[in-house]
C-alpha cells in the first residue's frame, strides 16, 4: 500500500494509472466503500462522500490513462485509505494528513515560550524536527516547546514530520515582538538636544498599545515617569508628560523622543515599556544618557561626565594637537593653571572617542570662551 503524507489546508493529488493509455472506466472510493468520484465517458461524477465539494480529478489526463484524485483544503479526518478501481485492478493509497500549529499566536513577545503542536491522525506515530531561523534544531513528538524566545528566533521555522519513512515539511512564520536593541546609550554635551529612538524589530499591519518611559536620574534617589503615551494603528499620542524635562514625542513609528537639552540632572538611565493590545507582558528597551560638561573656574579647567559610564571609559583633557595632559578612568578630570589655547575634553573607549567638548582658554588677563 502506497503512503502519502498531506498537510492540513493543502491540496493533495493521489495518482491512479491504468495500463491502457486511454480514458476508461474508473472510480475512487474510501475505506468505507463510499464512492468519491468516477467518470462517465469524458464527464466526472461525484459520489456522496464528505469530500464531495473538495474532491476533483484532472479530466485532461484521463486520455493518457491517468485518473488522479485531488483533495483540496485537507482536513486531519481525510486521513484514510483511498481505493482507485480501474480496469479490473485496485490501487490503494493511504493518506495521512498532519497539521502543525503554534500554541496561541505566531506573534510572541521576546522572552515568551513558543509551543508547536502536531495534529495527527489516530494510529500514526510521527516524529517532528524543527529548525529555527538561527539554525537551532529541536525534536519532539506531538508538542515541541522553545522557552525564552530571542529576537533571532523571528522568521520562518521549518518543521519536518516523519512517518513511514515519508516526510512532510511545514513552514511557520514566527514574529518575535521586541525592540531592535535591548539597550542604547546616548552621549551628549551639556545643552545639546537629545534624540532617543526606539525602533521595533517587527512590522505588523496594525499596532495598538500603550507605553511609558521611566527615568532614573543619577542624581535622584528614585525613578520618575517622564512620559506616557498611546499607540493606535501606528499613530502615537501623548497622554501625560512631566514639566521638567518637557519631552516631545513623534507622532509616527519608530517611537521617537526629544529632550530639549542635555543637563547633568537628566543624566541617568530610563526604561521604555510598551504594552501591546491582546498580548500579555511588555516590551522593554533601556536607554542611557551620558552628559559632558567642560568648565574653567579661576585657574582650574574641569571636565565632568554624568550618567552610566563603564569603568573602562577614559576621560581626558588635552590641548589641541598635543598629548593628553590628564587621562583617567574617572568621571571628572581637571588641569590647574591651563595654558592658553583650545582644550579638548574627550570621553573614549579603547581609543574610540564617544564624546568631545572643546573649551577655549584665553591668556590669564581674559575670561574663557566656550564655543
Amino acid at each position: 500500500k502506497k503512503v502519502v503524507l498531506g498537510k492540513k489546508g493543502d491540496t493533495v493529488e493521489l495518482t491512479c494509472t491504468a495500463s491502457q493509455k486511454k480514458s476508461i472506466q474508473f472510480h475512487w472510493k474510501n475505506s468505507n466503500q463510499i464512492k468519491i468520484l468516477g467518470n462517465q465517458g469524458s464527464f466526472l461524477t461525484k459520489g456522496p462522500s464528505k469530500l464531495n465539494d473538495r474532491a476533483d480529478s484532472r479530466r485532461s489526463l484521463w486520455d493518457q490513462g491517468n485518473f488522479p484524485l485531488i483533495i483540496k483544503n485537507l482536513k486531519i479526518e481525510d486521513s484514510d485509505t483511498y481505493i482507485c478501481e480501474v480496469e479490473d485492478q485496485k490501487e490503494e493509497v493511504q493518506l495521512l494528513v498532519f497539521g502543525l500549529t503554534a500554541n496561541s499566536d505566531t506573534h510572541l513577545l521576546q522572552g515568551q515560550s513558543l509551543t508547536l503542536t502536531l495534529e495527527s491522525p489516530p494510529g500514526s506515530s510521527p516524529s517532528v524536527q524543527c529548525r529555527s531561523p538561527r539554525g537551532k534544531n529541536i525534536q519532539g513528538g506531538k508538542t515541541l516547546s522553545v522557552s525564552q524566545l530571542e529576537l533571532q528566533d523571528s522568521g520562518t521555522w521549518t518543521c519536518t514530520v516523519l512517518q513511514n519513512q515519508k516526510k512532510v515539511e511545514f513552514k511557520i512564520d514566527i514574529v518575535v515582538l521586541a525592540f531592535q536593541k535591548a539597550s542604547s546609550i546616548v552621549y551628549k554635551k551639556e545643552g545639546e538636544q537629545v534624540e532617543f529612538s526606539f525602533p521595533l524589530a517587527f512590522t505588523v499591519e496594525k499596532l495598538t498599545g500603550s507605553g511609558e518611559l521611566w527615568w532614573q536620574a543619577e542624581r535622584a534617589s528614585s525613578s520618575k515617569s517622564w512620559i506616557t503615551f498611546d499607540l493606535k494603528n501606528k499613530e502615537v499620542s501623548v497622554k501625560r508628560v512631566t514639566q521638567d524635562p518637557k519631552l516631545q514625542m513623534g507622532k509616527k513609528l519608530p517611537l521617537h523622543l526629544t529632550l530639549p537639552q542635555a543637563l547633568p540632572q537628566y543624566a541617568g538611565s530610563g526604561n521604555l515599556t510598551l504594552a501591546l493590545e491582546a498580548k500579555t507582558g511588555k516590551l522593554h528597551q533601556e536607554v542611557n544618557l551620558v552628559v559632558m560638561r567642560a568648565t574653567q573656574l579661576q585657574k582650574n579647567l574641569t571636565c565632568e561626565v554624568w550618567g552610566p559610564t563603564s569603568p573602562k571609559l577614559m576621560l581626558s583633557l588635552k590641548l589641541e594637537n598635543k598629548e593628553a595632559k590628564v587621562s583617567k578612568r574617572e568621571k571628572a578630570v581637571w588641569v590647574l593653571n591651563p595654558e592658553a589655547g583650545m582644550w579638548q575634553c574627550l570621553l573614549s573607549d579603547s581609543g574610540q572617542v564617544l564624546l568631545e567638548s572643546n573649551i577655549k582658554v584665553l591668556p590669564t588677563w581674559s575670561t574663557p570662551v566656550q564655543p
Epitope: I24, Q25, H27, K29, Q33, K35, G38, Q40, G41, S42, F43, L44, T45, K46, G47, P48, N52, R59, E85, V86, E87, D88, K90
Partner: antibody, heavy 118, light 111 residues
C-alpha cells in the same frame, strides 16, 4: 447497436426477495457503468444505484442500500439487482440504464415490472 | 441530495407552437465548464428517452426541435414547433453528484 434486455415481470409475496437481470449487448460490457432506476405507477423516477462493471463495485442511493444488492457477471455481460424484504412499496417498474457520451442515461432496458401482493 | 423543481407540472400547447419547461436545482450543477443537467421524454409503457445531455447537447437521433439551455441552477427545455408525437412526460435530471436525482416531471399535451 447497444441493447439492454431485462428479465420478465415478477409477482412476489410480501417479505420475499426477487432477483432481476439486465443483459447487455452491442458494446464492451466492462467499459460502462450499469445504473438501476425505479418508477412506481404514475410516479417519478428514482435512482437506486450503480455497478462499475469493470471492478464489480456497487454504490447505492442511501434510501435503497438495505433494499437492493447489485452484482455483475462479467463473463456473460449480465447485471443483476436483488430486492429483499419486499413490501407493497416496492411494487414498481425497475429499469437498468447505461450512460452515453454524456452523463445522461442514453440507453435503457425495457423495464421489469415487480408486483408485491399476498 | 440535490432537489430539482420542474415547472409547470402540466402544459397544453397548440400544434406548431413553443413549449417551454423549466427546471431549478437546489444547488449549482456546474463543474469545469459543463452543466450536469439532462432532459428526458417518457411515453406511457416505455422507458425514458434521453433528449438533451449536459444542459444543451442534443442526443443523437433527437430532432433539432428540442433545445436545452441554462447553467448553474436554472435550466430550460424548449420544443418548437411542437408536434403531435411530443405528447409525453418530460423530466430533468442532474448527474452532478450521487445520487442522481430527477424532478417530478411535466405532462405536455398538444392541443
Amino acid at each position: 447497436q447497444v441493447q439492454l434486455q431485462q428479465s420478465g415481470p415478477e409477482l412476489v409475496k410480501p417479505g420475499a426477495s426477487v432477483k432481476m437481470s439486465c443483459k447487455a449487448s452491442g458494446y464492451t460490457f466492462t467499459d460502462y457503468v450499469i445504473n438501476w432506476v425505479k418508477q412506481r405507477t404514475g410516479q417519478g423516477l428514482e435512482w437506486i444505484g450503480e455497478t462499475y462493471t469493470g471492478s464489480g463495485s456497487s454504490y447505492y442511493n442511501e434510501k435503497f442500500k438495505d433494499k437492493a444488492t447489485l452484482t455483475v457477471d462479467k463473463a456473460s455481460n449480465i447485471a443483476y439487482m436483488q430486492l429483499s424484504s419486499l413490501t407493497s412499496e416496492d411494487s414498481a417498474v425497475y429499469f437498468c440504464a447505461r450512460r452515453g457520451k454524456g452523463t445522461g442515461f442514453a440507453f435503457w432496458g425495457q423495464g421489469t415490472l415487480v408486483t408485491v401482493s399476498a | 441530495d440535490i432537489v430539482l423543481t420542474q415547472s409547470p407540472a402540466s402544459l397544453a400547447v397548440s400544434l406548431g407552437q413553443r413549449a417551454t419547461i423549466s427546471c431549478k436545482a437546489s444547488q449549482s450543477v456546474d463543474y469545469d465548464g459543463d452543466s450536469y443537467m439532462n432532459w428526458y421524454q417518457q411515453k406511457p409503457g416505455q422507458p425514458p428517452k434521453l433528449l438533451i445531455y449536459a444542459a444543451s447537447n442534443l442526443e443523437s437521433g433527437i430532432p433539432a426541435r428540442f433545445t436545452g439551455s441554462g447553467s448553474g441552477t436554472d435550466f430550460t427545455l424548449n420544443i418548437h414547433p411542437v408536434e403531435e408525437e411530443d405528447t409525453a412526460t418530460y423530466y430533468c435530471q442532474q448527474s452532478y453528484e450521487d445520487p442522481p436525482t430527477f424532478a417530478g416531471g411535466t405532462n405536455l399535451e398538444i392541443k
